[in-house]
């Protein structure tokens, strides 16, 4: 028996359902009574889901997995993972034994888009050219860790005096806070871009300083 999975990682958004595709080619006369199907975590060998003895043995993994029972006899051994969490990320092995066996691993990459950044300025009044200001760009509930870029109004990257921190919350999602310290010009725009490297999603925020008032 030859087991086939997708070469590319499966990308799933947090709280959505994901399908880890796995297939095998049944011989003529194949019956489900002959099938032993095991899904397990590749690294720890923890059991995720199984089908053996001619029946679905059910989920051994937080009751959020399911097979496609009607498609098994055609060689579809795919696994449905419901309400994906950050902790589900990793490699899953699909193991099929009939008379002989084969296995293959498929990677699950979990992702969550970052929120539109909110911008704050300190100090936020009585600003004059030449003042040192601190601009904070905050974006929330994304995964995996973000890449943060700052640019001025002309699109020139600002790399000096940038401090970025990323903190994971109880669900494993990251809140990003990036601080730019800059000396004010006569007027100017400062843009923050928060990029999710998996989703290739960019979230933009900017602040424009034109004397008074400030615009965000």
């Amino acid at each position: 028996v030859e087991v086939q999975v997708s070469e590319d990682p499966v990308v799933a958004l947090v709280d959505t359902d994901a399908t880890l595709r796995c297939s095998f080619s049944p011989e003529p006369g194949f019956s489900l009574a002959q099938l032993n199907l095991i899904w397990q975590l590749t690294d720890t060998k923890q059991l995720v889901h199984s089908f053996t003895e001619g029946r679905d043995q059910g989920s051994a993994y937080s009751n959020r997995t399911a097979l496609f029972p009607d498609l098994l006899v055609q060689g579809n051994a795919s696994l449905r993972l419901q309400r994906v969490r950050v902790t589900d990320e990793g490699s899953y092995t699909c193991f099929v034994s009939i008379q002989d066996f084969d296995s293959a691993a498929v990677s699950l990459q979990v992702a969550a888009p970052y929120s539109k950044p909110s911008m704050t300025l300190e100090p936020n009044k009585d600003l004059r050219p030449g003042n040192m200001v601190t601009i904070t760009c905050s974006s929330y509930q994304g995964y995996p860790e973000a890449e943060v870029f700052w640019k001025d109004g002309q699109g020139v990257p600002l790399t000096g005096n940038v401090t970025t921190s990323q903190m994971a919350n109880e669900r494993g999602l990251f809140d990003v806070h990036s601080v730019l310290r800059v000396v004010l010009g006569a007027n100017g725009t400062y843009s923050c871009l928060v990029r999710n490297p998996v989703l290739q999603q960019d979230a933009h925020g900017s602040v424009t300083i034109t004397g008074q008032p400030l615009t965000f």
Epitope: Q34, I38, L47, T52, E53, Q99, F101
Partner: antibody, heavy 121, light 107 residues
Framework: QVQLVESGAEVKKPGSSVKVSCKAS????????ISWVRQAPGQGLEWMGR????????NYAQKFQGRVTITADKSTSTAYMELSSLRSEDTAVYYC??????????????WGQGTLITVSS | DIQMTQSPSTLSASVGDRVTITCRAS??????LAWYQQKPGKAPKLLIY???SLQSGVPSRFSGSGSGTEFTLTISSLQPDDFATYYC?????????FGQGTRLEIK
């Protein structure tokens, strides 16, 4: 390279039970199947049953159904075969066996050294 | 249960001989057949699986063929180390069953 090491020889009385252990090392114990095969003196090979340790599910040959219990302890990578209501015909060498390089659970390229169980009054 | 019948039960041959052992299944088993060699006091050793696939490390003088119900194990040129008992085994369906064995002895 998988190694299977079985417990030592035993002499048992008719009607009693015996439990043989098989400790695996050097391979992925929990995912694969461990079978038990016996061989009476001067006789052929006889498959008794198998267990998939990760599932804890065992299959038995009809001949032994109700008399044999195969279990596995994933934490120690050890499989067990218990045979009850022993009779003199159960005198045999008992092997645990495992498929590996042959890509099958049901062909056996790794064997324990064998455990001789003698049933005698 | 699927019955496996080997012939002959005993085979006398000399070093250098080409020998063939036959195994018949009571019903079709496709190619799900293995061959083992066993020496006295030792565990069996897997030679061939899936009717004709040579197990890693087994000398190429051993070969297997057949499908359905009739299978053969051939040793192209007997070596002194080959005198032993040979078993066929089907793994098409439960329960797994073995042939009764063929003892290969020195003539």
């Amino acid at each position: 390279q998988v190694q299977l090491v079985e417990s030592g020889a035993e002499v048992k009385k008719p009607g009693s039970s015996v439990k043989v252990s098989c400790k695996a090392s050097g391979g992925t114990f929990s995912s694969y199947a461990i079978s038990w095969v016996r061989q009476a003196p001067g006789q052929g090979l006889e498959w008794m049953g198998r267990i998939i340790p990760i599932l804890g599910i065992a299959n038995y040959a009809q001949k032994f159904q109700g008399r044999v219990t195969i279990t596995a302890d994933k934490s120690t990578s050890t499989a067990y075969m218990e045979l009850s209501s022993l009779r003199s015909e159960d005198t045999a060498v008992y092997y645990c066996a495992n498929g590996g390089d042959s890509s099958s659970w049901y062909t056996f390229d790794y064997w324990g050294q064998g455990t001789l169980i003698t049933v005698s009054s | 249960d699927i019955q496996m019948t080997q012939s002959p039960s005993t085979l006398s041959a000399s070093v250098g001989d080409r020998v063939t052992i036959t195994c018949r299944a009571s019903e079709t088993i496709s190619s799900w057949l293995a061959w083992y060699q066993q020496k006295p006091g030792k565990a069996p050793k897997l030679l061939i699986y899936k009717a004709s696939s040579l197990q890693s490390g087994v000398p190429s003088r051993f070969s297997g063929s057949g499908s359905g119900t009739e299978f053969t194990l051939t040793i192209s040129s007997l070596q002194p180390d080959d005198f032993a008992t040979y078993y066929c085994q089907q793994y098409y369906s439960y329960p797994i069953t073995f042939g009764q064995g063929t003892r290969l002895e020195i003539k």
